[in-house]
């Protein structure tokens, strides 16, 4: 904490005196106090010196010294009285601005502490204070009107008794402002409106504030509408309401409507759009692709956006096959309303099973008719592989069948030794089959391909492996020729359960 020299809480001097106030701290220090022309401020190392060689009543005040670098924010203060027999008051302000219910400090500082007993607060021209004015006095700070009210916005003077007569300060204007947190609060209902030509409509614009001084109007496409205003006062707020009633809407009523309210704090506005249509409408759309591919076992949410007026009379999700006649569980269907005319419908399909691939359709109905939106869901599977030894046209042939989705690619490997899976060190030959024969390819099903590897003579201490892969995964099957007949080995990890 900084230290002030002289180390007294208050100092009383006569006009014309030399005053030197020194503040010393650990780091740099700063003086704070009423800005005044009658001081000189200079630094001397870690101290700051405030001095005047001709003190006047205007130097009366509290001077505080702080250490800006001190995290604890410690400060020291000294109060200086310059007791001028002709000037009992040093008034630090022409005007004081506070909000209602705040304390209002009228900063007339007494220049001589001896005069404290005879001070009083009056309104200008000697008028007494208003009834219920609760105030206190501090010779260091002035008069405080506690919990000031708007009605106490007046011009005040501080009075001191000197030699049996009252000496007045210059006047201080007190402005007590009503607490207006901001522009009036606004509501405009509905937030959006759609009507068929000939129907009735109502738009309500209302504003409220703690202060009665505010304006509100409703405008249509930047044209101010002449609407009678209803006023009310409840919950300590003033309310102004404008109601636009339209018995039979037409296209010229469509457009942007703005509710605008303003007060001294500024302006608030909110807008809505009114759409007039010829007839009922129902539009279905999705942000998703209508053709979906998902890996078996994973989940999928199908989302449909519905725009409709009038509201929906019915809606449902339907599974159109081809695998079973099951229907989506109602608990998996979810509806959320974005606003009055737009809704989102979601069908959750968790942990998809092979039998759940196919077409899903969302159907909705309103007075405008039926609409449907259909998704096609194909499941992706990692390849399943099997290899057999056979003779085709008299030639020994290894036949590899691979089944999965998307369509698997096939690679043959020949490697030394007997193994469940060829590793790089053992590989003798690799054959890629760029065009395996497609055995089956139906919508929503796995694609089965077949690859043939013609082998003139089977090498008995070798393994022939068929590998298949697609974007989901890979599968393989090892074929081991043995003199007593051929052995085939699916790899351990092939045990696949969707």
């Amino acid at each position: 904490i900084p230290v002030i020299e002289p180390s007294v809480p208050e100092l009383v001097v006569k006009p014309g005196a030399t005053v030197t106030l020194r503040c010393v701290g650990n780091g740099s220090v700063e003086w704070d106090g009423p800005p005044s022309p009658h001081w000189t401020l200079y630094s001397d190392g870690s101290s700051s010196i405030l001095s005047t060689n001709n003190a006047t009543f205007q130097n009366t005040g509290t001077y505080r010294c702080t250490e800006p670098g001190d995290p604890l924010g410690g400060s020291a203060a000294i109060h200086l009285y310059v007791k001028d027999p002709a000037r009992p008051w040093n008034v630090l302000a022409q005007e004081v601005v506070v909000f209602e219910d705040q304390d209002a400090l009228l900063p007339c500082l007494l220049t001589d502490p001896v005069l404290e007993a005879g001070v009083s607060l009056v309104r200008v021209r000697g008028r007494p204070l208003m009834r219920h004015t609760n105030y206190s006095f501090s010779p260091w700070h002035g008069f405080t009107i506690h919990r000031a009210k708007f009605i106490q916005s007046q011009d005040y003077q501080c009075s001191a008794l000197m030699g049996g007569r009252k000496v007045m300060s210059i006047s201080i204007r007190l402005k007590v402002q009503k607490v207006i947190p901001g522009p009036p609060a606004l509501t405009l209902v509905p937030a959006e409106l759609v009507r068929i030509r000939g129907e009735a409509a109502q738009i309500v614009c209302s504003a409220s504030s703690v202060d009665v001084n505010f304006d509100v109007f409703l405008q249509h496409n930047n044209t101010k509408l002449a609407i009678p205003q209803q006023s009310d006062f409840h919950n300590n707020r003033y309310q102004k309401v404008l109601t636009l009633n339209l018995d039979q809407v037409d296209f010229q009523h469509a457009g942007n409507y703005s509710c605008v309210a303003s007060n001294v704090q500024g302006k608030h506005s909110t807008s809505m759009f009114f759409r007039v249509v010829e007839s009922a409408y129902l539009n279905l759309s999705s942000e998703q692709n209508l053709i979906q591919e998902v890996t078996v076992g994973e989940g999928l949410n199908l989302k449909v956006m519905v725009e409709a007026y009038p509201g929906l009379q019915g809606f449902n999700w339907t599974y159109l096959g081809p695998f079973s006649d099951h229907q989506p569980e109602p608990k998996l269907a979810n509806a959320t309303t974005k606003d009055t005319y737009r809704h989102t419908f979601t069908l959750s399909l968790p942990r998809l099973k092979p039998s759940e691939a196919g077409r899903y359709s969302f159907l909705a109905r309103n007075p405008g008719g039926w609409r449907a939106l259909t998704f096609e869901l194909t499941l992706r599977y990692p390849p399943e592989v099997s290899v057999i030894w056979t003779f085709i046209n008299g030639s020994g042939t290894l036949l590899c069948a691979a089944s999965g989705y998307p369509q698997p690619n096939v690679t043959w490997l020949q490697c030394s030794g007997h193994t469940d899976r060829c590793d790089e060190a053992q590989v003798l030959q690799v054959w890629d089959d760029p065009y395996p024969e497609v055995l089956s390819q139906e919508p929503f099903h796995k694609v089965t391909v077949q690859s043939l590897l013609t082998v003139e003579t089977l090498e008995h201490n070798q393994t022939y492996e068929c590998r298949a892969h697609n974007s989901v995964g890979s599968g393989s099957w090892a074929f081991i020729p043995i003199s007593a007949g051929a052995h085939t080995h699916p790899p351990d990890e092939f045990l696949f359960t969707p």
Partner: antibody
Framework: QVQLQESGPGLVKPSETLSLTCTVS????????WSWIRQPAGKGLEWIGR???????KYNPSLKSRVTMSVDTSKNQFSLKLSSVTAADTAVYYC???????????WGQGALVTVSS | QSVLTQPPSASGTPGQRVTISCSGS????????VNWYQQLPGTAPKLLIY???QRPSGVPDRFSGSKSGTSASLAISGLQSEDEADYYC???????????FGGGTKLTVL
């Protein structure tokens, strides 16, 4: 380190009221004097007035009839309202902390306010 | 029109010493202390000198202030290109009961 930041509308219509707020950060607004100063484009600086945290104000006599300053210690903010503005009030408005010898040690970056219809 | 008179412009070459004057009256410079501000292009003013001749921390000692009677002056020695700015004197004015600013001097480093 004390920092000041002016905010408010950049455009005000003639005859309306200009309103600006200064937010003080890095220190308390309490026990200090806070001033507004303005500078028309290409011209010099003009002191508008000062406010103490208790709400005490002193204004430049040339602007006194149109100026109101207020302070909100709970938000560490003080504000300026200048009524009945004209094109002559178009300027960059600065808020600043006024020290004991009338020196402005800390300044905001300034807010340009244009008065135009 | 400012009650304080400053030359509208001043110039100097790097390394040179330049002085900017500020002339006032008994109600401002004559009876009160003077502060000086530097305003670099496009920025807020910065306190350069307070109480006639005191430098805030961070201001180089190339800058010095003095006062005599109803006039004050700011001296910049060892002029540098980054000193190119507007300079304002600002004493307290008793009739204003606040600070009054000079018209400003534009310093150009040639």
């Amino acid at each position: 380190q004390v920092q000041l930041q002016e905010s408010g509308p950049g455009l005000v219509k003639p005859s309306e009221t200009l309103s600006l707020t200064c937010t003080v950060s890095g220190g308390s607004i309490s026990s200090n004097y806070w001033s507004w100063i303005r500078q028309p484009a290409g011209k010099g600086l003009e002191w508008i007035g000062r406010i103490y945290t208790s709400g005490s104000t002193k204004y430049n006599p040339s602007l006194k009839s149109r100026v109101t300053m207020s302070v909100d210690t709970s938000k560490n903010q003080f504000s300026l309202k200048l009524s009945s503005v004209t094109a002559a009030d178009t300027a960059v408005y600065y808020c600043a902390r006024e020290g004991i010898v009338g020196a402005f040690h800390y300044w905001g970056q300034g807010a340009l306010v244009t008065v135009s219809s | 029109q400012s009650v304080l008179t400053q030359p509208p412009s001043a110039s100097g070459t790097p390394g040179q010493r330049v002085t900017i004057s500020c002339s006032g009256s008994s109600s401002n410079i004559g009876s009160n202390t003077v502060n000086w501000y530097q305003q670099l292009p496009g920025t807020a003013p910065k306190l350069l000198i307070y109480s006639n001749n005191q430098r805030p921390s961070g201001v180089p000692d190339r800058f010095s202030g003095s006062k005599s009677g109803t006039s004050a002056s700011l001296a910049i020695s060892g002029l540098q290109s980054e000193d190119e700015a507007d300079y304002y004197c600002a004493p307290w004015d008793d009739s204003l009961n606040g600070v009054v600013f000079g018209g400003g001097t534009k310093l150009t480093v040639l």
